[in-house]
């Protein structure tokens, strides 16, 4: 029961996490204009992995895609790659984990196969979560570096007569979504791995025990047994997990120049 709950919860947590990673990857607000010096702005800039946007006081919002691959910073490309790898691994992990769920019957799939699939999906979720966290963290680090660089030369101009305020960018909502989503996927993966340990039957070798009854001697050599299903020899010599009492249904069978942070 605990195994099923752990596996199910791991699946749900991972599902939420992967949905969050997808959402974060698609979001435009990876970096947003820093409003510390000017909290009331008529033009608000924000940028995502795929496009940059400008929202005006008038309510008009214009977004422009990054229509170049070669012109983009290597770090941005790396972040994109990490997020995509995270999504792909997560999606495959979800697919595998669906078939690995104890509550779903697929033909006569053995517990050992389910255990292996659970472990595989768990590892995939862990890697997926790590990819997302790494991607978001690389982007955040890039933002912090650029923030302090632009703060150092906040105002540039001719002899200080004309001021050109450099737009500084800070953490956008997508970063927080990405961190949380990555964390959830990671936790979900760990839960799946824990559930796998419960699913995987341990090889139990029972030593022959001699019972000396009065009159005649009978030696019992029992095979493995399934609790609540009666004793019987393990004729197929397959691993059977003694998981305590189980109910019947629990038995498994526009190109333009942009600021890139």
């Amino acid at each position: 029961m605990a195994v099923t709950a752990c596996q199910g919860l791991g699946f749900v947590v991972s599902l939420i996490g992967i949905a969050g990673i997808i959402a974060a990857t698609c979001m435009d607000q990876w970096s947003t204009q820093d409003l510390y010096n000017n909290p009331v702005t008529a033009v608000f800039n924000y940028q995502g992995l795929w496009r940059s946007c400008v929202r005006e006081s008038s309510g008009f919002t214009e977004c422009r895609g990054y229509f170049t691959l070669l012109g983009l910073p290597a770090m941005l490309q790396a972040v994109r790659a990490l997020m995509i790898v995270g999504i792909v691994l997560g999606a495959i992990g979800l697919l595998v984990s669906i078939f690995a769920l104890k509550c779903i019957r697929i033909g006569s799939m053995e517990d050992s196969a389910k255990a292996n699939m659970t472990l595989t999906s768990g590892i995939m979720f862990i890697v997926s979560g790590l990819c997302a966290i790494a991607g978001v963290s690389v982007f955040a680090n890039m933002l912090v570096t650029n923030f302090w660089m632009s703060t150092a030369n906040m105002y540039t101009g001719m002899g200080g007569m004309v001021q050109t305020v450099q737009t500084r960018y800070t953490f956008g909502a997508a970063l927080f979504v990405g961190w949380v989503a990555g964390g959830l996927t990671l936790i979900g993966g760990v839960m799946m791995c824990i559930a796998c340990r419960g699913l995987a039957p341990e090889e139990t070798n029972y030593k022959a025990v001699s019972y000396h009854a009065s009159g005649h001697s009978v030696a019992y050599k029992p095979g493995g047994f399934k609790a609540s299903t009666g004793f019987g020899s393990n004729t197929k010599n397959k691993k059977i997990y003694d998981g305590g009492a189980r109910t019947e249904d629990e038995v498994q069978s526009y190109p333009s120049k942009h600021d890139y942070v």
Epitope: A42, E56, S57, S58, G59, D259
Partner: antibody, heavy 118, light 113 residues
Framework: DVKLVESGGGLVKPGGSLKLSCAAS????????MSWVRQTPEKRLYWVAT????????YYPDSVKGRFTISRDNAKNTLYLQMSSLKSEDTAMYYC???????????WGQGTSVTVSS | DIVMTQSPSSLTVTAGEKVTMSCKSS????????????LTWYQQKPGQPPKLLIY???TRESGVPDRFTGSGSGTGFTLTISSVQAEDLAVYYC?????????FGAGTKLELK
Amino acid sequence: DVKLVESGGGLVKPGGSLKLSCAASGFTFSSYTMSWVRQTPEKRLYWVATISSGVSYTYYPDSVKGRFTISRDNAKNTLYLQMSSLKSEDTAMYYCTRLTKGNAMDYWGQGTSVTVSS
Amino acid sequence: DIVMTQSPSSLTVTAGEKVTMSCKSSQSLLNSGNQKNYLTWYQQKPGQPPKLLIYWASTRESGVPDRFTGSGSGTGFTLTISSVQAEDLAVYYCQNDYSYPFTFGAGTKLELK
């Protein structure tokens, strides 16, 4: 056809109050950011207030902050400017405007005159 | 606050002449996010409210004759009328739309010789 009609102007004593109204028609009023702009007798233009569409964020220059309040009633398609603690320098023609791309004011009303004098 | 300075304050021209007026801002009006300059030009004829001519420094409002051209970037902007017509006699204002408070220039008055 877009139409903005201001009303509520008049003569008021210093320290007094006045509420200007702007009736909008010919466009989806609730979807647009609206502003008030005034023109002094010397023909200088000054931005007075802005109210965004949707959640209705408001913006004011320091010269009117705390004295003027911009508001809107989307059900009535009307923009308001509540003016209090009026000063002689508030004497001007007040225009109701609609904001468009580039934060530009694409439509202006005919204006309503406000005179602050004792 | 961004200070908008227009020059000259008045211009006397003859019909058909090419006219250029300047507008300078104390801070750059160029937004790095979309590479657009948040400067607007308005025309005001006597007894009328101002009328939008050009936004984003060079984008002509629909219905505005193509003899009106806006140019410039950063802090220096220009409004050019390629061939002045009698109906163009008015006061022209430039406005900062980049940051609050929105500020206007004092205007350039276009008069007929």
